[in-house]
């Protein structure tokens, strides 16, 4: 069996996870891509996905997750903003290619989020603050990922909206350089 490797990201609450998953440009540029959490003994759970076909440089926001697919560079950028301790876990980027099994990109991401303010004086983390303007997505960010997407008759209430509204802003505070530590299973 192939050994799956992990990259460990250690961050503090409020920080942003910023992952770039590479893919083969010619094969997968327009394929739908997704961000999943791996749960022990359970099927991976898709937390967010790009549209189908995937649009170039078109951010899709689902809660605190932002996906951007850069076709020109063959990479999927995944950001999880305002990290919470409960976000800790094992994640992966995948490409959907039914009828085949989803194709895993990159190494799996072992995210460890700890409590504590990251921007304290004397800390050697480069704490920065950015405001990202997320353009509104034109379609609901559903991830059926299958040949017959289902219809939705009612969008969730605004407090649980899946996609950004026009001119929505995401404050990315304490974005730091991340130490990546490969971990082998």
């Amino acid at each position: 069996a192939t050994k799956l490797t992990e990259e460990k990201y250690e961050l503090k609450e409020g920080q942003t996870l910023d992952v770039k998953c590479d893919y083969t440009l010619e094969k997968f540029a327009s394929s739908q891509k997704a961000w999943q959490i791996i749960r022990d003994g359970e099927m991976p759970k898709t937390l967010a996905c790009t549209e189908r076909p995937s649009k170039n440089s078109h951010p899709v926001q689902v809660g605190r997750i932002i996906l951007e697919d850069y076709h020109d560079h063959g990479l999927l950028r995944v950001r999880m903003v305002n990290l919470q301790v409960e976000d800790s876990g094992l994640y992966q980027c995948v490409i959907y290619q039914p009828p085949k099994e989803p194709h895993m990109l990159f190494d799996r991401i072992r995210l460890v989020v700890t409590k504590g303010f990251s921007g304290t004086p004397g800390s050697n983390e480069n704490s920065t603050q950015n405001v990202y303007k997320i353009p509104p997505t034109t379609t609901k960010a559903l991830c059926p990922l299958y040949t017959s997407p289902r219809t939705v008759t009612q969008a969730p209430p605004k407090s649980t909206a899946d996609v950004s509204t026009p001119d929505s802003e995401i404050n990315l505070t304490n974005v730091t350089d991340i130490i990546r530590v490969p971990v082998f299973n």
């Epitope: 959490i37 099927m43 937390l47 996905c49 605190r64 976000d87 039914p98 009828p99 289902r150 649980t160």
Partner: antibody
Framework: QVQLQESGPGLVKPSETLSLTCAVS?????????WGWIRQPPGKGLEWIGS???????YYNPSLKSRVTISVDTSKNQFSLKLSSVTAADTAVYYC????????????WGQGTLVTVSS | DIVMTQSPDSLAVSLGERATINCKSS????????????LAWYQQKPGQPPKLLIY???TRESGVPDRFSGSGSGTDFTLTISSLQAEDVAVYYC????????FGGGTKVEIK
């Protein structure tokens, strides 16, 4: 539209293996989704047994895992359930359903088949 | 396992009146990263399989009448039938998929 139909023996003896098959029509199993089994003892609630992807990846209810095997036959567009070492407590209506792992729900369902465990 | 507790066990409501069913999970079924509650509601009529009504706690499945609505977040959820119709007589189940799929015990809705 998508339809599912369970089939298999309605009576199984204690300690034997329960075997059921779910035939899917109106949708190719290979096109996606997981495919699951759920059971309902007479007059009681629902219990998820397990789910399978067309590639063969399986996920089981931890409380049943040691006795359950779910398999898929894409050429026949069907998937199957085997539950070993059955007792009277396994008497139930067994349903198969399409399992949408993103929406985390089951839809549609088969009509169900009653399996009685008795000697 | 996450335990799903439904209340009441049964409910008798007059035609045209509101029916409210509660579902409480032993731990949160919310993934805060994507702000989704992994909770679904089903309707099961006598002699029939369950039918999906609501997923993600509040999103109605296609074709489900708008008198059915779901609300709640975290551990406490509600299914509301705003104006009970005769065809709504059934048992209603909640189901979570935050951690290994489990169902509530069901709530039987009858006409008063």
């Amino acid at each position: 539209q998508v339809q599912l139909q369970e089939s298999g023996p309605g009576l199984v003896k204690p300690s034997e293996t329960l075997s059921l098959t779910c035939a899917v029509s109106g949708y190719s199993i290979s096109s996606g989704y997981y495919w699951g089994w759920i059971r309902q003892p007479p007059g009681k609630g629902l219990e998820w047994i397990g789910s399978i992807y067309h590639s063969g990846s399986t996920y089981y209810n931890p409380s049943l895992k040691s006795r359950v095997t779910i398999s898929v036959d894409t050429s026949k567009n069907q998937f199957s359930l085997k539950l070993s070492s059955v007792t009277a407590a396994d008497t139930a209506v067994y349903y198969c359903a399409r399992h949408d792992d993103y929406l985390s729900s089951f839809d549609p369902w088969g009509q169900g088949t009653l399996v009685t465990v008795s000697s | 396992d996450i335990v799903m507790t439904q209340s009441p066990d049964s409910l008798a409501v007059s035609l045209g009146e509101r029916a409210t069913i509660n579902c409480k999970s032993s731990q949160s079924v919310l993934y805060s990263s994507n702000n989704k509650n992994y909770l679904a509601w089903y309707q099961q009529k006598p002699g029939q399989p369950p039918k999906l009504l609501i997923y993600w706690a509040s999103t109605r499945e296609s074709g489900v009448p708008d008198r059915f609505s779901g609300s709640g977040s975290g551990t406490d959820f509600t299914l509301t039938i705003s104006s009970l119709q005769a065809e709504d007589v059934a048992v209603y189940y909640c189901q979570q998929d935050h951690s290994f799929i489990t169902f509530g015990g069901g709530t039987k809705v009858e006409i008063k």
